[in-house]
C-alpha cells in the first residue's frame, strides 16, 4: 500500500561533484498525493540549516513525482556545502537527508578530476 505521506527522495550521504562557473540544478524529488506541499531549501551551517530565501527555485512536474529545484547559475566556490529540502505538509515539517556539493575551481576539461578523485580529495575544495 502506497503511503500518502509526503516523501522527499534525497539519498542519505549523497554527494555531487561540480565545477565553479557551471550551471547546476539541485533536485529535491517530492512525492505527494493531493495538494503539493510548500517546499524550501536550506544550507547547513554546523547543526543549523539556514533557509535560502533569495535563490532561484522552480518546480518540474513528472507523472509520479515532482522536483523542487534549486538553481545555481553559475556555481560559485562558496556554494560548497550540504543542503537539505523541507516540506510543510498538514502542519508537519518533513526534512530530507542532506546532500553535499563539492565545488572545485574551474580547470580546463583535460585537468578536471574524476568523480573518484573528487570523492577522495575533499581538500581540493578549500
Amino acid at each position: 500500500k502506497e503511503s500518502c505521506d509526503v516523501q522527499l527522495y534525497i539519498k542519505r550521504q549523497s554527494e555531487h561533484s561540480i565545477l565553479a562557473g557551471d550551471p547546476f540544478e539541485l533536485e529535491c524529488p517530492v512525492k505527494y498525493c493531493a495538494n503539493r506541499p510548500h517546499v524550501t531549501w536550506c544550507k547547513l551551517n554546523g547543526t543549523t540549516c539556514v533557509k535560502l530565501e533569495d535563490r532561484q527555485t522552480s518546480w518540474k512536474e513528472e507523472k509520479n513525482i515532482s522536483f523542487f529545484i534549486l538553481h545555481f547559475e553559475p556555481v560559485l566556490p562558496n556554494d560548497n556545502g550540504s543542503y537539505r529540502c523541507s516540506a510543510n505538509f498538514q502542519s508537519n515539517l518533513i526534512e530530507s537527508h542532506s546532500t553535499t556539493l563539492y565545488v572545485t575551481d574551474v580547470k580546463s576539461a583535460s585537468e578536471r578530476p574524476s568523480k573518484d578523485e573528487m570523492a577522495s580529495r575533499p581538500w581540493l575544495l578549500y
Epitope: Q7, L8, Y9, I10, K11, R12, S14, E15, H16, S17, L44, T47, E95, H97, S98, K115, D116, A119
Partner: antibody
Framework: EVQLVESGGGLVQPGRSLRLSCTTS????????IHWFRQAPGKGLEWVGR????????KYTASFKGRATISADGSKSIAYLQMNSLKTEDTAVYYC????????????WGQGTLVTVSS | DIQMTQSPSSLSASVGDRVTITCRSS???????????LNWLQQKPGKAPKRLIY???KLDSGVPSRFSGSGSGTDFTLTISSLQPEDFATYYC?????????FGQGTKLEIK
C-alpha cells in the same frame, strides 16, 4: 522478484585484474547504493566500497582506493567491481548488495562469487 | 576508522533460550539526522549474509518478531527471545553512519 547475481569470479594469477559484475532486477538500481563486500575463507565481512548509480559517486575503504573501481550502468541495472594488481590475500567471496538510499527500506544481497588468486 | 567490537565471539545455546549479542562502536554512530545507522546481519554457512535489523531496531520484512535490536550511541544489542533451530548462524553488526563502513568480527551461535 528481487535478484542480485554476481558473476566474473574464478581463478586469477597474482598481479592480474578482474572485473566482477552484479546484475540486478526487481527494483530501480538508481534508488539504491550498490555496495561491494568481501569475505576471505573462514573470516569476517569487509566493506570494499559503494557506488551511487544515480550520479556515479563512489566511496572506498582506504585499502582498496586506487586498486578497486566500483561503477554502475543504471540503464542496464548492472554494477561492476574492477580489481587490479590482485594479491593472494584478495582470495575471497565477493558480494554485491543494494541498499535503498532514502529510507533504508531494503538491503538485498547477492549470493556471492568466489575469487581465488593463485599462481 | 570506527572499530566495531562484538561479544561474545561465539556462543552455545539451546532451542528456546533467550540470547543477547552486544556490539560496541569506538565512537558514536549517531548521524546528524539524529539516527544511528547500525545494522545486524545473519549469515549461515556457505550462504550470503541477510539483513535482519537496520536503524538499530527496525526489523526487515519477513524477519520473525523473536529478533529485536536496541541501543544508542556506542552500545547496541541483538536479542533473540526464543531460539529456533534455524537461528543457529553467525551474526554481524555493521555501521553505515561513518565512512568507511565497518563490521564487528561476528558472533557464531552454536547448538549446545
Amino acid at each position: 522478484e528481487v535478484q542480485l547475481v554476481e558473476s566474473g569470479g574464478g581463478l586469477v594469477q597474482p598481479g592480474r585484474s578482474l572485473r566482477l559484475s552484479c546484475t540486478t532486477s526487481g527494483f530501480n538500481i538508481k534508488d539504491t547504493y550498490i555496495h561491494w563486500f568481501r569475505q576471505a575463507p573462514g573470516k569476517g565481512l569487509e566493506w570494499v566500497g559503494r557506488n551511487d548509480p544515480a550520479n556515479g559517486n563512489t566511496k572506498y575503504t582506504a585499502s582498496f582506493k586506487g586498486r578497486a573501481t566500483i561503477s554502475a550502468d543504471g540503464s542496464k541495472s548492472i554494477a561492476y567491481l574492477q580489481m587490479n594488481s590482485l594479491k593472494t590475500e584478495d582470495t575471497a567471496v565477493y558480494y554485491c548488495a543494494s541498499y535503498e538510499g532514502y529510507y533504508e527500506r531494503f538491503g538485498y544481497w547477492g549470493q556471492g562469487t568466489l575469487v581465488t588468486v593463485s599462481s | 576508522d570506527i572499530q566495531m567490537t562484538q561479544s561474545p565471539s561465539s556462543l552455545s545455546a539451546s532451542v528456546g533460550d533467550r540470547v543477547t549479542i552486544t556490539c560496541r562502536s569506538s565512537q558514536s554512530l549517531l548521524d546528524r539526522d539524529g539516527k544511528s545507522y547500525l545494522n545486524w546481519l545473519q549469515q549461515k554457512p556457505g550462504k550470503a549474509p541477510k539483513r535482519l535489523i537496520y536503524l538499530v531496531s527496525k526489523l526487515d520484512s519477513g524477519v520473525p518478531s523473536r529478533f529485536s535490536g536496541s541501543g544508542s550511541g556506542t552500545d547496541f544489542t541483538l536479542t533473540i527471545s526464543s531460539l529456533q533451530p534455524e537461528d543457529f548462524a553467525t551474526y554481524y553488526c555493521w555501521q553505515d553512519t561513518h565512512f568507511p563502513y565497518t563490521f564487528g568480527q561476528g558472533t557464531k551461535l552454536e547448538i549446545k
